[in-house]
């Protein structure tokens, strides 16, 4: 049998083969970071010869060349240094403006190992135009220097650089340039996952309930898709399974898509997911017309059932046909719902194309995109009803120009990306919907990615402190209210001296807020049962603080979802007629419910809330506590049904300064506060000045550790009384 020669080494790099040395096998070169392979790949022809894409001679020696970043071609109203023809990895370029101009963007940029500059385009602007000066990205040339409404600017890239973004932009009435910033990049450059995830996430989050559907003011800030309760998102996942995609990579495509589906179903939008795999022909595994496309388990199982072998007879990449099958699906749905109906017109559509190469058959995919734009009537007023994300994977045959042509172009967003490999793709999908990037008061979103800070993971968490030392913790439950424990205020000192420290992306120390008013439960009296021999009693240990200003929502500050509210109902994706009882049944539905609280050092610690019969045995231990309760006959005098109980097995115990903090659980990638830390039988931080040091109780300790948390399901009347205008409560 014919095979290709094996003398294909690359000096300083490695290679992989898709199908061994046999005809049809694709040889892919890779180099260490900061270098790129030339050529990038070779294909084993049926003649037994290697063919190099776009090469003049049949076999050139493969080498790893140093990556370089493009130089500025021109920089208006300022100077840049050093002036080089191109810049090595690690090299810097600095920008300064002439008098009368202010520098926007990054004053210093560094060339990164992927051939891309870090930071943002530097612009010297005097603010004279209707739109800001759009700048000139590195390596680009701009024509057009008027920035009035209706004025246009055009961009092209110097020498062999490839333009991604908009080649032409127009200054619009709202002072924003149409399209997206053009970037000139080396043909071999690619995107790092840590850049793609936030870019993709920011854009995508507009469609994922970025506008809180129950918010009372519906003002639109920038580009924010308002998928209301009645709104609907159709998500179309297009997975390339052509010959050049290895079976392993196809599995990662599937896994990434599953991650995406999983995350999307956790948001309070009505979503239908279509799944299409394609090579020479598309195969529709799930259509948005199928009622199962709204069911996460059905969608995931149809993804799992997608087989690499489905396309073994057709090995080309027919992106046109894949997009055309989306068009046909849309057309069918439009016929079904009626072209003029709101039901059709209010559907938002997002297409995610995962491919490893450029289309090589079936005609231009741009034609299908044009048809899609036409059927959805995408014009400047309906621009938000379609997003096409074109993601190239592998630096192979991926065609920047084609991806850029297919991807949507929206101001401040990117829709076309090239990632180095499928591992990078998986990372992106893992992190892109850490939609702690959302800017509205959508509740219960914490950043779950591995590289998130503690505050980003629990952005509702706040510290309440008097003028001197820290005392308590609390949780944001709206942009101006904090829920905490009443016993934090039992000394009744002047609240004007107190501060609430809220997370802030601009400072690792957070931001301090004054307290406008403290609402402390009138039922709380720590000495209420002293004459019964109960030295401390923590019934009604609940308080609300109204901050003096609203908190600006960010990655570091965001409310947690309170059960029994409409906001939580949407996050749980429960039907509209749900009640408070339904929430309790869904959230506290086991004998032992895994939950969390936040430690003094900001980390998330694990506990198990004991319910039912286990609650009784959890609470009974209190009778062994003779110091606080010397004459206790009935445990329920101390541990009323207002309390949740934890502290058994491997549970962590809260420390004294952690009182008032949220006891919360995760459901569908969202977080819900079911309790707040109140009191306990053991302080693991006692005698330690170090926030990071906690001592476990010795196994022999009597009584063993137990912790009690105010159960928010038992405090509903009080919460409704004070938060009725802040949150939308469900019937009990």
């Amino acid at each position: 049998a014919t095979s290709c020669p094996q003398n294909v080494n690359i000096s300083g790099g490695t290679f992989t083969l898709s199908h061994g040395w046999a005809p049809g096998s694709l040889l892919i070169y890779s180099c260490p970071q900061g270098l790129y392979p030339s050529p990038a790949s070779r294909l084993c022809k049926s003649s037994g010869q290697w063919q190099t894409p776009r090469a003049t001679r049949s076999l050139t020696k493969a080498v790893c060349k140093p990556v370089r970043c493009p130089a500025p071609v021109s920089f208006e109203n300022g100077i840049y240094t050093p002036r080089l023809g191109s810049y090595p990895v690690g090299g810097n370029v600095s920008f300064e403006c002439e008098d009368g101009f202010i520098l926007r963007g990054s004053p210093v940029r560094q060339c990164r190992p992927n051939g891309m500059w870090d930071g943002e385009t530097a612009v010297c602007d005097n603010g004279a135009g209707h739109c800001p000066n759009p700048g000139i990205s590195l390596g680009a040339v701009r024509t057009g220097s008027r920035f009035g409404h209706g004025d246009k600017v055009r961009y092209r890239c110097s020498s062999n650089l490839v333009l991604t973004g908009s080649a032409e932009r127009e200054c619009q009435g709202n002072g924003v340039w149409s399209g997206t910033e053009p970037i000139c990049r080396q043909p071999y450059s690619y995107d790092f996952p840590e850049d793609v995830a936030p870019a993709l996430g920011t854009s995508f989050s507009h469609m994922l309930g970025a506008t809180n559907p129950t918010q009372r003011t519906k003002e639109s800030l920038g580009r924010k898709i308002q998928i209301q309760r009645s709104g609907h998102l159709n998500l179309y996942l297009l997975l390339d399974s052509s010959q050049s995609v290895s079976e392993n990579d196809f599995l990662i495509f599937k896994e990434s898509a599953s991650l995406m589906v999983d995350r999307i179903f956790s948001f309070e939008i009505n979503v239908s997911v279509a799944i299409i795999t394609f090579a020479s022909e598309p195969k529709v595994l799930m259509s948005v017309l199928n009622v199962n496309s709204r069911d996460i388990t059905e969608v995931i199982s149809s993804l799992e059932n997608a087989k690499y072998k489905d396309h073994e007879n057709g090995t080309g990449t027919n992106t046109y046909a894949a997009l055309n099958s989306v068009y046909l699906m849309m057309n069918n749905q439009m016929q079904l719902l009626g072209m003029k109906t709101m039901a059709w017109q209010e559907i938002r559509h997002a297409i995610i194309l995962l491919t490893d190469g450029k289309s090589n058959m079936g005609g231009s995919p741009k034609t299908a995109v044009d048809q899609i734009r036409e059927i959805l009537n995408i014009n400047q007023k309906r621009n938000d009803y379609l997003d096409i994300y074109a993601i190239g994977v592998g630096k192979l045959d991926v065609d920047w120009r084609e991806l850029n042509e297919l991807g949507s172009k929206k101001d401040g967003e990117r829709h076309a990306f090239i990632l180095q490999d499928t591992k990078a793709l998986h990372q992106v999908f893992e992190h892109m919907l850490d939609v702690s990037k959302l800017t509205d008061t959508i509740c219960g979103v914490g950043n779950m990615s591995a590289n998130a800070s503690d505050q980003e993971r629990t952005p509702w968490h706040v510290t309440i402190k008097p003028k001197s030392q820290e005392t308590c913790r609390g949780a944001l439950i709206s942009d101006q209210w904090v829920l905490t424990a009443a016993h934090c205020f039992r000394d009744g000192n002047d609240h004007s001296l107190w501060r609430v420290n809220v997370g802030d992306p601009k400072s690792q120390w957070g931001k301090e807020f004054l307290i406008e008013k403290a609402v402390i439960s009138p039922g709380f009296d720590v000495f209420a049962k002293k004459n019964q021999g109960i030295l401390e009693f923590y019934g009604d240990d609940i308080a609300l603080l109204k901050l003096a200003q609203k908190v600006k929502m960010s990655t570091h500050a965001r409310p947690i979802c309170l059960p029994c509210t409409m906001e939580a109902n949407l996050a749980l994706r429960r039907p509209q007629g749900s009640t408070c009882r339904d929430h309790e049944n869904e959230l506290l539905n086991k004998q032992s419910v895994p939950a969390h609280f936040v430690a003094l050092n900001g980390s998330k610690l694990n506990i198990n809330l004991k319910m039912g019969v286990e609650w009784t045995s959890c609470a009974e231990v209190v009778s062994q506590e003779k110091t606080m309760f010397p004459n206790l006959t009935d445990v329920r005098e101390v541990v009323t049904d207002q309390f949740l109980c934890s502290g058994t097995q491997e549970d962590e115990s809260p420390c004294k300064g952690e009182s008032g903090g949220a006891v919360f659980l995760e459901r569908r990638f969202r977080f819900f506060q079911v309790g707040l830390v109140s009191w306990g039988l053991y302080n693991p931080c006692l005698g330690s000045a170090d926030k990071n040091s906690r001592k476990r109780a010795p196994r022999s300790k009597v009584p063993p550790p137990r912790d009690f948390h105010i159960n928010l399901f038992r405090m509903q009347p009080w919460l409704r009384q004070h938060l009725g205008d802040v949150l939308n409560f469900l019937p009990l």
Partner: antibody, heavy 118, light 106 residues
Framework: QLQLQESGPGLVKSSETLSLTCTVS??????????WGWIRQPPGKGLEWIGT???????YYNPSLKSRGTISVGTSKNQFSLKLSSVTAADTAVFYC??????????WGQGTLVTVSS | SYDLSQPLSVSVALGQTARITCGGN??????VHWYQQRPGQAPVLVIY???NRPSGIPERFSGSNSGNTATLTISRGQGGDEADYYC?????????FGGGTKLTVL
């Protein structure tokens, strides 16, 4: 869907100031998506742009009006208005208020005829 | 200032194609928008950014822009298309309308 409605006197004396108001319904006038403007059409003639006001408060006027025009926004009542001073018979026209998104006039009022009498 | 010139009138036989032009210096470097104004009514946007149709405008309306001339094309002309048509551009936050073209359907 946005709707615009012009209102104001149909007759203005020469050399006085013409005042018109446009009431917007169906959306907030303060939205950064929109800009608002006045366009007029003398009888039997073509359209002539008078001026535009943006959500930022920035205004632009037709240079041919030589500073006679003033456009302002009253967000509380969701209205914007036009004042045209020192009018003459040449200012007799149907005045349209219009609103836009991006770079076009997407929404128009039905127009109001203003006659300048001597 | 920038000037747009349009023919005063254009006639088209019922069912045929009408072309209305809008001339301007290097007009292709600008985006051209077209409005239809039926007698006694306010103008309506029929084409924006050279060739895009807003929702509700029939496919018979199309636009192009090249060199010094932008063109509005109305295919399969109907009685209801009889109206004045205005081209418009923005130039440095200034709105410029063409003089208008009266379309007559014969």
């Amino acid at each position: 869907q946005l709707q615009l409605q012009e209102s104001g006197p149909g007759l203005v004396k020469s050399s006085e100031t013409l005042s018109l108001t446009c009431t917007v319904s169906g959306g907030p006038i303060s939205s950064s998506s929109y800009y608002w403007g006045w366009i007029r059409q003398p009888p039997g003639k073509g359209l002539e742009w008078i001026g535009t006001i943006y959500y930022s408060g920035r205004t632009y006027y037709n240079p041919s009006l030589k500073s006679r025009g003033t456009i302002s926004v009253g967000t509380s009542k969701n209205q914007f208005s036009l004042k045209l001073s020192s009018v003459t018979a040449a200012d007799t026209a149907v005045f349209y208020c219009a609103g836009g998104v991006g770079v076009t006039w997407d929404y128009w009022g039905q127009g109001t005829l203003v006659t300048v009498s001597s | 200032s920038y000037d747009l010139s349009q023919p005063l009138s254009v006639s088209v036989a019922l069912g045929q194609t009408a072309r209305i032009t809008c001339g301007g210096n290097d007009i292709e470097s600008k985006n051209v928008h077209w409005y239809q104004q039926r007698p006694g009514q306010a103008p309506v946007l029929v084409i924006y950014r050279n060739s895009n149709r807003p929702s509700g405008i029939p496919e018979r309306f199309s636009g192009s822009n090249s060199g010094n001339t932008a063109t509005l094309t109305i295919s399969r002309g109907q009685g209801g298309d009889e109206a004045d048509y205005y081209c418009q551009v923005w130039d440095s936050s200034t709105v410029i309308f063409g003089g208008g073209t009266k379309l007559t359907v014969l």
